[in-house]
Amino acid sequence: KSSSEATNITPKHNMKAFLDELKAENIKKFLHNFTQIPHLAGTEQNFQLAKQIQSQWKEFGLDSVELTHYDVLLSYPNKTHPNYISIINEDGNEIFNTSLFEPPPAGYENVSDIVPPFSAFSPQGMPEGDLVYVNYARTEDFFKLERDMKINCSGKIVIARYGKVFRGNKVKNAQLAGATGVILYSDPADYFAPGVKSYPDGWNLPGGGVQRGNILNLNGAGDPLTPGYPANEYAYRRGIAEAVGLPSIPVHPIGYYDAQKLLEKMGGSASPDSSWRGSLKVPYNVGPGFTGNFSTQKVKMHIHSTSEVTRIYNVIGTLRGAVEPDRYVILGGHRDSWVFGGIDPQSGAAVVHEIVRSFGTLKKEGWRPRRTILFASWDAEEFGLLGSTEWAEENSRLLQERGVAYINADSSIEGNYTLRVDCTPLMYSLVYNLTKELESPDEGFEGKSLYESWTKKSPSPEFSGMPRISKLGSGNDFEVFFQRLGIASGRARYTKNWETNKFSSYPLYHSVYETYELVEKFYDPMFKYHLTVAQVRGGMVFELANSVVLPFDCRDYAVVLRKYADKIYNISMKHPQEMKTYSVSFDSLFSAVKNFTEIASKFSERLRDFDKSNPILLRMMNDQLMFLERAFIDPLGLPDRPFYRHVIYAPSSHNKYAGESFPGIYDALFDIESKVDPSQAWGEVKRQISIATFTVQAAAETLSEVA
């Protein structure tokens, strides 16, 4: 087919036609279908769902839909030897045991294969000892304990409340502090919003509800046994002792009823301040150990989970591009859930399904996108982003040459207050322009744009009159595409009001109570927020795949680079004397940022003025835009994190969920006053400044006039 023949872009087949085809009722139906039984990674049920999705995507009209499988390390509780935690008396008798399962919600009592709460990849073990309460187990919590309160966690079992940071970071911090085990619990202060009933009468966490989750510290590695390479049939696998990111101490999660029993007996030091106290009727003493009358009692963990190499399945659907079939726009979200996945992931998977259906409808009418669109249903996201990472490892050479953009599609909702977007600065203008064209679903904003309600409810902290867009961190399937491969990425979902709802995530996250009914009764009865998210995600994909000139604005990268350079310089200037002593200068970085700003503006002028009808010129300019994100990749990666290679953004070393800017410099400066060898530490700061400078300058040069 000639390119002119293939495009078929008529006024009938435009963005409006695509958006109009999206229906809330379909999303509701798909969500119901995806949430009737558990779809745990590595199980037969999740394989069957993969085959169902493959079949339906074919019916919807995609050109091809394939299953790709990998054999990766997963982790499951031992069915005959359950995990639990005890309080034992001086004779070793168990006088209290935590529950072995969550009471299933009404109507689900007879569902089989509900995995009991566990911390995936916990090693086996039965440590016993005194308890220390470590608040959220953040870096700063351990600083407070060890440095200010002089409390030693070595040989102790620590109990930490969920929230604020990724659970894997909590476990890593506890290990470094010398703990022999970790108990994670959900405190009502973080998972019970005032004035709301607990499930099934509301969306709050009941006392027996527990958050599952993996506790890995993979740093982008994918399958722990095959870092850097796909876990296929001929892959070399490391021994378990050499596996990446596995915790070394037993870990187990509990609900707040069980936590009450452990925390009410705590003695030792009082909590340092109110930020360490939750909402349970317990003293929140730090310990170590129990108070006077109970001081001879200890805590014992009984963890018997096993890690095993298990087959997982991704579903990859292709809608071939008419003009640039070798340019890929990817929409991906995971399919595996901890239990029913009412929100995570199926509220996202249902939206992807409807987006595929809408694109398929247009395709059946003779339309094709300009560029190829790839749709992905990832497996084993909950076990460390394994499906997406293995697929990207297998296809890395294609992706780094052809990948235009990746749009993530996990949970569509984590609340019903306003939009939440995290993306590369290249997509800021795309997101703003799109949301100005979409109708707000919010009450009180009838007839107003999504942009307007979003700006009102979630204003940018720096730039007035604009909505907040956050940095990409990790904890979801965009990680390998953005942080490792440097493919422009973004994500969007509906969120809670962060001002009034201080709890972390949504209360029923990763619990058995995350059901279809939770969504349909309490979060989005009309599925209007799901529809809006479908319009945002789908609209972004449509524009990225169909715009003649890629909808990326490099000027917005210039703006944030200036902001990030200012921020890191201000952090560094908390040490003016050392800056002088070790001749640390940010002049080169500021110069590179200025050069980037200048070149980006000149590029934008050329982009506006060039002859769009010249296919060679068009391809050349689009390639410069596509490869700009790639130019921020350092092939050597960040220190000790070889798969985090983006120099401008990385997941925070202290919280995988959060993004950090100029992470190499940031980490080199972090807690630098405590380093044993200040000369070496400041030398590393200088090295990181030089890497950042080179990278920004090199990226700028990719935007320079080619000849």
Epitope: S429, F463, D556, D587, S604
Partner: antibody, heavy 121, light 111 residues
Framework: EVQLVESGGGLVQPGGSLRLSCAAS????????MSWVRQAPGKGLEWVSA????????YYADSVKGRFTISRDNSKNTLWLQMNSLRAEDTAVYYC??????????????WGQGTLVTVSS | QSVLTQPPSVSAAPGQKVTISCSGS????????VSWYQQLPGTAPKLLIY???KRPSGIPDRFSGSKSGTSATLGITGLQTGDEADYYC???????????FGGGTKLTVLG
């Protein structure tokens, strides 16, 4: 040839509002940060606000934060400054200035002729 | 009170050399580029020096700029009566996320 022409100044009572405009020509307006700089009678230059190229991120001096709003329309090559809750100390000549480097403010290579704003009862 | 400090006035005879200082801090002049502006009576400011020491086309080489640490200096040699004007230094402040100016220096050419 680059031209910046301000308009919209005038006499206004304390607490009142005024909207200044700056019509730009002779350069790719959308690619450059634009600023408003003011000069009270007999006094020095005071930067008021800037708006970036691209999506139009905004920056304000503390003295006007929450009262003034800068905006731009790239399709019309126009910059605006909406001034609310005006005070006597806002009396000044307001200049529109173009950044020389690009999307964020570095230094100003072109200035308008200025428009006088007088806040008085 | 301006963030950057300049002397209120300087004066010198025609043909002489004059320098105008501009003092700031690590968050502005210390890390960012300094520019200088000339404002002739009754006119809009005009860019004189950018990037600490560069001259836009059309600005004679009698005007020079330098920066050291947290201070910057504008030098004018071969003073002419037409140089009588107010001179302002300016830069970005990385802590304030704002453009900052000096209070201005009135140059009088004696004679």
């Amino acid at each position: 040839e680059v031209q910046l022409v301000e308009s919209g100044g005038g006499l206004v009572q304390p607490g009142g509002s005024l909207r200044l405009s700056c019509a730009a020509s002779g350069f790719t307006f959308s690619s450059y940060a634009m600023s408003w700089v003011r000069q009270a009678p007999g006094k020095g230059l005071e930067w008021v606000s800037a708006i970036s190229g691209g999506i139009g991120s905004t920056y304000y001096a503390d003295s006007v934060k929450g009262r003034f709003t800068i905006s731009r329309d790239n399709s019309k090559n126009t910059l605006w400054l909406q001034m609310n809750s005006l005070r006597a100390e806002d009396t000044a000549v307001y200049y529109c200035a173009k950044d020389a480097v690009g999307a964020t403010p570095y230094y100003f290579d072109y200035w308008g002729q200025g428009t006088l704003v007088t806040v008085s009862s | 009170q301006s963030v950057l400090t300049q002397p209120p006035s300087v004066s010198a005879a025609p043909g002489q050399k004059v320098t105008i200082s501009c003092s700031g801090s690590s968050s502005n002049i210390g890390i960012n580029y300094v520019s200088w502006y000339q404002q002739l009576p009754g006119t809009a400011p005009k860019l004189l020096i950018y990037d600490n020491n560069k001259r836009p086309s059309g600005i004679p080489d009698r005007f020079s700029g330098s920066k050291s640490g947290t201070s910057a200096t504008l030098g004018i040699t071969g003073l002419q009566t037409g140089d009588e004007a107010d001179y302002y230094c300016g830069t970005w402040d990385s802590s304030l996320s704002a453009v900052v100016f000096g209070g201005g220096t009135k140059l009088t050419v004696l004679g």
